[in-house]
């Protein structure tokens, strides 16, 4: 057992049917001694008396909001949670596993930038008593600061019969510098409490390897004289990393046609402007990645040819 | 259809084109290491990042781009001392940071052209003989070396007396191939930037 | 004490269906996730598949994804494994167990898949 | 599709200290527990093992479990005739949990 925060606490178990459970001790936040008497959430039964109690939690009957009381007032509480360990593994019942980039990825971060600014998100199905708490640093064994705000509810999405509850925090770096060499990753820790199941998950990765850049910015055309062809041009994100000299991007191009089924055409280039066919009823798309480290590519920027 | 990569001028900043043949080696070699050695911990999350220039050379801080002086993170190790020859340096353009900068790259690829090829002698001697290191990588870094051209003391070769420890050796290897590839991504934005400058 | 009763076991066609079931009793069936694992006659033990406590998800052997499909009723404490388009080399003996680090085997069912 | 290799069968006198290995890869056993069972023809698989070693409460002392690395054994110390039967270790991989791993399966068989 160990305590979460002040007068909440998680009760680790090795979850599997006739388990023995764990014992606990309660102890009343009191200086009294005698007349203490013990009540599980709402219910008036006692379960015992004196300034400790003592119970074998094995189920989720057993946790949940123990008071102590004397003659009526309420003396303490302790809210006891479980953390189920199925077969050597906590259990992940709370979020859905998002299968990106890999089996087993529950949190998902990105970063615009190399300003130590990033995102992380979550999916879940459950639409009440959930919280969330975020704590992210840098490297584990000597821990440098990073500050994440509090998570909140992003997105509602309707999967077949279930409805899906995306959950994101924004989380900064304390004193980052974009041209760094990363040796030591981000660490996040996302502790989630749904009713009382307490579970905890956890990311870890370089800035370098989430990064994707927002889409191109300005985006336009300049149809070239007596020819099908067109000059593409576009501009660097604004939340792109400066110098841009430095941090520099690449760019692909694509013509596509009405028809998803229709031949793309895709240039690579790392400048800011291209040359290519306008077909009619096509559009233009250009997306961006870091030239030098091949992390996700940005979202597309597009425009009808027409 | 894919734009052929434009090959930099002959008035352009010599050692760009170098570095993005560097960029591009290093990166093959890590990529054929993690397919070779799958069974070994090879890739980023399982590997411990070590870097084999700590201390010895200051490339990110030499080399920070003028506009993040600013930034306090950035400075909490700038070095002062200066080396200023170098044949990658317009006369014009010579600066004390510049020559600094391009002579802490020098450095950091003398210090991995030793360790690579005191890695290549060991691995040359596995009778698995499962991967060796790139002789085009090894000729890159060389050449990005002699388009730098500062003069330096020779680092002698590390010869070792015991019987080598080839899955150390591996694993070794793959430390050494993501420090390396994170490094030559630095050196590519230092030369892009320098170009533009 | 905990137990896991199988039943619907036989002889099929191939091509059929059948359906098993784990009756279980002597906990509470709601809070833990199962699985079903087969044995073909002569050899090892192969993973079939597993549902959560509640449900809400499912996992399946490559070997007989979209043909299986794994099912409980919590109010009848009840694990059910729907079998569809069987084949020769689905006999075996399947056994329904409880996830955990120790866990519950149900006596096991024998299926044969013969023309 | 067995990613847990065990050898066919081993044998043993009564008395004699017979062992299992159980062999796989960083993503199942480097990063998982492995448990143990026991089959006796004709019957469901009993657990010996879990967690990597320790025992349910009924299994006799002489059965003992190791993991290092990616590999993990059984130990039968003073083998007896009644534990001639088969053996499976059993883990999981780290992309693919909640899905069981066994074994390819141990004939043990005691001699005289």
């Known amino acids: 057992i160990w305590e979460l925060k002040k007068d909440v606490y998680v009760v680790e178990l090795d979850w599997y049917p006739d388990a023995p459970g764990e014992m606990v001790v309660l102890t009343c936040d009191t200086p009294e001694e005698d007349g203490i008497t013990w009540t599980l959430d709402q219910s008036s039964e006692v379960l015992g008396s004196g300034k400790t109690l003592t119970i074998q939690v094995k189920e989720f009957g057993d946790a949940g909001q123990y008071t102590c009381h004397k003659g009526g007032e309420v003396l303490s509480h302790s809210l006891l949670l479980l953390h189920k360990k199925e077969d050597g593994i906590w259990s992940t019942d709370i979020l859905k596993d998002q299968k990106e980039p890999k089996n087993k990825t529950f949190l998902r971060c990105e970063a615009k930038n190399y300003s130590g600014r990033f995102t992380c998100w979550w999916l879940t199905t459950i639409s009440t008593d959930l919280t969330f708490s975020v704590k992210s640093s840098r490297g584990s064994s000597d821990p440098q600061g990073v500050t994440c705000g509090a998570a909140t509810l992003s997105a509602e999405r309707v999967r077949g019969d279930n409805k899906e509850y995306e959950y994101s925090v924004e989380c900064q770096e304390d004193s980052a510098c974009p041209a760094a060499e990363e040796s030591l990753p981000i660490e996040v820790m996302v502790d989630a409490v749904h009713k009382l199941k307490y579970e905890n998950y956890t990311s870890s990765f370089f800035i370098r390897d989430i990064i994707k850049p927002d889409p191109p910015k300005n985006l336009q055309l300049k149809p070239l004289k007596n020819s099908r062809q067109v000059e593409v041009s576009w501009e660097y994100p604004d939340t792109w990393s400066t110098p841009h000299s430095y941090f520099s991007l690449t760019f692909c191009v694509q013509v596509q046609g009405k028809s998803k089924r229709e031949k793309k055409d895709r240039v690579f280039t790392d400048k800011t402007s291209a040359t290519v066919i306008c077909r009619k009823n096509a559009s233009i798309s250009v997306r961006a990645q870091d030239r030098y480290y091949s992390s996700s590519w940005s979202e597309w920027a597009s425009v009808p040819c027409s | 259809r894919n734009l052929p990569v434009a090959t930099p001028d002959p008035g352009m900043f010599p050692c760009l084109h170098h570095s993005q043949n560097l960029l591009r080696a290093v990166s093959n070699m890590l990529q054929k290491a993690r397919q070779t050695l799958e069974f070994y911990p090879c890739t980023s999350e399982e590997i411990d990042h070590e870097d084999i220039t700590k201390d010895k050379t200051s490339t990110v801080e030499a080399c920070l781009p003028l506009e993040l002086t600013k930034n306090e993170s950035c400075l909490n190790s700038r070095e002062t001392s200066f080396i200023t020859n170098g044949s990658c340096l317009a006369s014009r353009k010579t600066s004390f940071m510049m020559a600094l900068c391009l002579s802490s790259i020098y450095e950091d690829l003398k210090m991995y052209q030793v360790e690579f090829k005191t890695m290549n002698a060991k691995l040359l001697m596995d009778p698995k003989r499962q991967i060796f290191l790139d002789q085009n990588m090894l000729a890159v870094i060389d050449e990005l070396m002699q388009a730098l051209n500062f003069n330096s003391e020779t680092v002698p070769q590390k010869s070792s007396l015991e019987e080598p420890d080839f899955y150390k050796t591996k694993i070794k290897l793959c430390i050494l191939l993501h420090a390396f590839r994170i490094r030559a991504v630095t050196i590519d934005r230092v030369m892009s930037y320098l170009n533009a400058s | 004490q905990v137990q896991l009763v199988q039943s619907g076991g036989g002889v099929v066609q191939p091509g059929r269906s059948l359906r098993l079931s784990c009756a279980a009793s002597g906990f509470t069936f709601s809070s833990y996730g199962m699985h079903w694992v087969r044995q073909a006659p002569g050899k090892g033990l192969e993973w079939v598949a597993f549902i959560r406590y509640d449900g809400s998800n499912k996992y399946y052997a490559d070997s007989v994804k979209g043909r299986f499909t794994i099912s409980r009723d919590n109010s009848k404490n009840t694990l059910y494994l729907q079998m569809k388009s069987l084949r020769a080399e689905d006999t075996a003996v399947y056994y329904c167990k409880t996830h955990g680090s120790h866990d519950n085997w149900g006596q096991g069912t024998m299926v044969t898949v013969s023309s | 599709s067995y990613v847990l290799t065990q050898p066919p069968s081993v044998s043993g006198t009564p008395g004699q200290r017979v062992t299992i290995s159980c062999s796989g890869g960083?993503?199942?056993?480097?990063?998982?527990?492995v448990k143990w069972y026991q089959q006796l023809p004709g019957t469901a698989p009993k657990l010996l093992i879990y967690g990597n070693d320790p025992r349910p409460s009924g299994v006799p002392d002489r059965f003992s479990g190791s993991k290092s690395g990616t590999s993990a054994s059984l130990a039968i110390t003073g083998v007896q005739a009644e534990d001639e039967a088969d053996y499976y270790c059993?883990?999981?991989?780290?992309?693919?949990?909640?899905?069981?791993?066994f074994g390819t399966g141990t004939k043990v068989t005691v001699l005289g």
């Open positions: 059993q883990s999981y991989d780290r992309g693919t949990h909640p899905a069981l791993l």
């Open positions: 960083r993503s199942n056993i480097g990063s998982n527990t």
